[in-house]
């Protein structure tokens, strides 16, 4: 099923793309893009009958089109409001400059030792998954090569179902080894929550009476904290699938040389532990310092506030973290009403489908105008 | 409706210490700075310090370091404040006030005599 | 520390008249400057923060002005419970320190 979150990242993909390419490109926007990387999303499932995802593919893509097309108008807008409320809030809290900025300081220690913990188990954990599944893996192959020596004569009967467990089995550890790596970061999205939570009620009273923007500022924080979460999540999941990929053809090689002749079935059987081991020991090396890269990244988010907040704070364009923010809310809001009103759309006569419709479309609407409304 | 409300009037030896109250409602008390402040007969406003209710932070004026000491109770949502050591020259009017743009809301006051 | 110094100590008014206090900081506080009303008896009462803005129900014949090193608080037609002590403090850098006071009473 097509998610809110794989739609929206489409649409920021693409419109941080055309920022970044000149002025006219935003201006003239070419919807048809957008409208072809939407609508490459469904192509998987529309093949089965699937009305849903149709009906789904239908709605979304005006809407879609629309709401990228007002991101594009607010962004500057929204800079400019953004440049307000910074200013406002550094103004309330200047006269305790100091105070505010030590206090930030021992929120990132207190963050980088609710994290170090969970950094350290993730790397000892890579390291043991990796470990384990080479153990696991490396039998096969001595296996194989032990039958091939005993069973020379009936090749194909003795070393084919090996040669499928070992498929099998790869799959069966990396869906393992994703189970066992990603939810560290759920574990960091917590912790992330209770760190900005904390910040949020040490400083609230020196903000007093600007302490709405102070939380919109600490909202931004926390949702540019969550996406690299999520970014950790995404590459962990990423590894193990270029694991995944790495690692099947090495049992595909195995399977397509035992049609061959033996000595073409021995070299290959010889190679096989060598390059599980080698396959396995680069996904370690690769995977094990993204928890520590993911606290950098955390600690450099929270410097960033830090200095937003501070005196000297420079042009920090920070109002694109927003933008993506309030896109995401949007897109989610838009598909919470759409299950929504499927659901209800089955119990529906066809006259109240009718009427529904028309009140969607206007919803539509609302949900698309003013994209992101600061608290004044 | 936001109160303050301070404890009542206290008559103390010199030497002694003495403890005044002042218990916030109507209002998020972990929110906002809580301070007091000292008014001498016929004076003017002397800012002791002031404490951050949510983590206990206190702030004083350098005058007033080991004389006052500031904590809160969170639970009671109240704030107190203890005086050591007193002598006639700590006899005034003690107000808690609230905020940190000026203060937006004052207890009543509490009027401490040192006597022998 | 900064200090406030507040002018006049006192003064003598009518209802209906206008009056005008000072308050100079030792060393520029930017905007961050509060006034209070305190009658006899009573604890002070927030007019102003910020140099400018109006406490909340404020009357608006209280205003506020000036920035950095000269500060002013003006009562338009004074009204009789506008009499009594008036403060300015500044709540820049800690510590905060009060003017020495404008007592403001009836002619």
């Known amino acids: 099923e097509v998610s809110a979150d794989q739609v929206a990242t489409v649409m920021w993909d693409y419109f941080s793309q055309l920022s970044n390419n000149a002025k006219e490109a935003v201006e003239h926007l070419q919807k048809s893009e957008l409208t072809q990387q939407l609508n490459a999303l469904f192509q998987d499932k529309l093949g089965e009958v699937n009305t849903y995802a149709g009906d789904l593919q239908k709605k979304l893509v005006p809407f879609a089109t629309e709401l990228h097309e007002r991101l594009a108008k607010d962004s500057e807008k929204l800079k400019e409001e953004i440049g307000k409320e910074l200013e406002e809030l550094r103004a309330r809290l200047l006269p305790h400059a100091n105070e505010v900025s030590q206090k930030i300081g021992d929120n990132l220690r207190e963050l980088q030792q609710r994290l170090e913990p969970y950094a350290d188990q993730l790397r000892t954990q890579v390291s043991t998954q990796a470990e384990q599944l080479r153990r696991q893996l490396t039998p096969y192959a001595q296996r194989m090569e032990r039958v091939l020596r005993e069973n020379a004569d009936s090749l194909q009967a003795s070393l084919r179902p090996h040669a499928d467990e070992l498929k099998a089995k790869i799959d069966q550890n990396v869906e393992e080894l994703k189970g066992r790596l990603t939810p560290y970061a759920d574990e960091f999205k917590v912790k992330i929550d209770q760190t900005v939570e904390e910040l949020r009620r040490s400083l609230a009273p020196y903000a007093q009476d600007t302490q709405e923007k102070l939380n919109h500022q600490l909202e931004g924080l926390t949702f540019q904290m969550k996406k690299n979460a999520e970014e950790l999540k995404a590459r962990i999941s990423a590894s193990a699938e270029e694991l995944r990929q790495r690692l099947a053809p090495l049992a595909e090689d195995v399977r397509g040389n035992l049609r061959g002749n033996t000595e073409g079935l021995q070299k290959s059987l010889a190679e096989l532990g060598g390059h599980l081991d080698q396959q396995v020991e680069e996904f370690r090396r690769r995977v094990e310092p993204y928890g520590e890269n993911f606290n950098k990244a955390l600690v450099q988010q929270m410097e960033q506030l830090r200095q937003k907040l501070g005196p000297h704070a420079g042009d920090v364009e920070g109002h694109l973290s927003f933008l993506e923010k309030d896109l995401r809310d949007k897109v989610n809001s838009f598909f919470s009403t759409f299950k929504e009103k499927e659901s209800q759309d089955k119990t529906l006569s066809l006259p109240e489908l009718e009427q529904q419709q028309e009140q969607q479309q206007e919803q539509q609407q609302e949900q698309v105008q003013m994209l992101a409304p600061l608290e004044s | 409706e936001v109160q303050l409300q301070q404890s009542g009037p206290e008559l103390v030896k010199p030497g002694a210490s003495v403890k005044i109250s002042c218990k916030a409602s109507?209002?998020?008390?972990?929110?906002?700075?809580m301070s007091w402040v000292k008014q001498s007969h016929g004076k003017s406003l002397e800012w002791i310090g002031r404490?951050?209710?949510?983590?206990?932070?206190?702030f004083y004026n350098q005058k007033f370091k080991g004389k006052a000491t500031l904590t809160v109770d969170k639970s009671s949502s109240t704030a107190h404040m203890e005086l050591l050591s007193l002598t006639s020259e700590d006899s005034a009017v003690y107000y808690c006030?609230?905020?940190?743009?000026?203060?937006?809301?004052w207890g009543q006051g509490t009027t401490l005599t040192v006597s022998s | 520390d900064i200090q406030m110094t507040q002018s006049p100590a006192s003064l003598s008014a009518s209802v209906g008249e206008t009056v005008t206090i000072t308050c100079r900081p030792s060393?520029?506080?930017?905007?961050?400057l509060a006034w209070y009303h305190q009658k006899q008896g009573k604890s002070p009462q927030l007019l102003v923060y910020?140099?400018?803005t109006l406490a909340e129900g404020v009357p608006s014949r209280f205003s506020g002005s000036g920035s950095g090193t000269q500060f002013f608080l003006k009562i338009n037609s004074l009204q009789p419970e506008d009499f009594g002590s008036y403060y300015c403090?500044?709540?820049?850098?800690?510590?905060?320190?009060f003017g020495g006071g404008t007592k403001l009473e009836i002619k």
């Open positions: 403090q500044h709540h820049y850098v800690s510590p905060w320190t």
């Open positions: 060393e520029n506080i930017h905007s961050y």
């Open positions: 006030g609230r905020g940190i743009i000026g203060f937006d809301y």
């Open positions: 404490i951050n209710p949510y983590n206990g932070d206190t």
């Open positions: 109507g209002y998020s008390f972990i929110g906002y700075f």
């Open positions: 910020d140099a400018t």
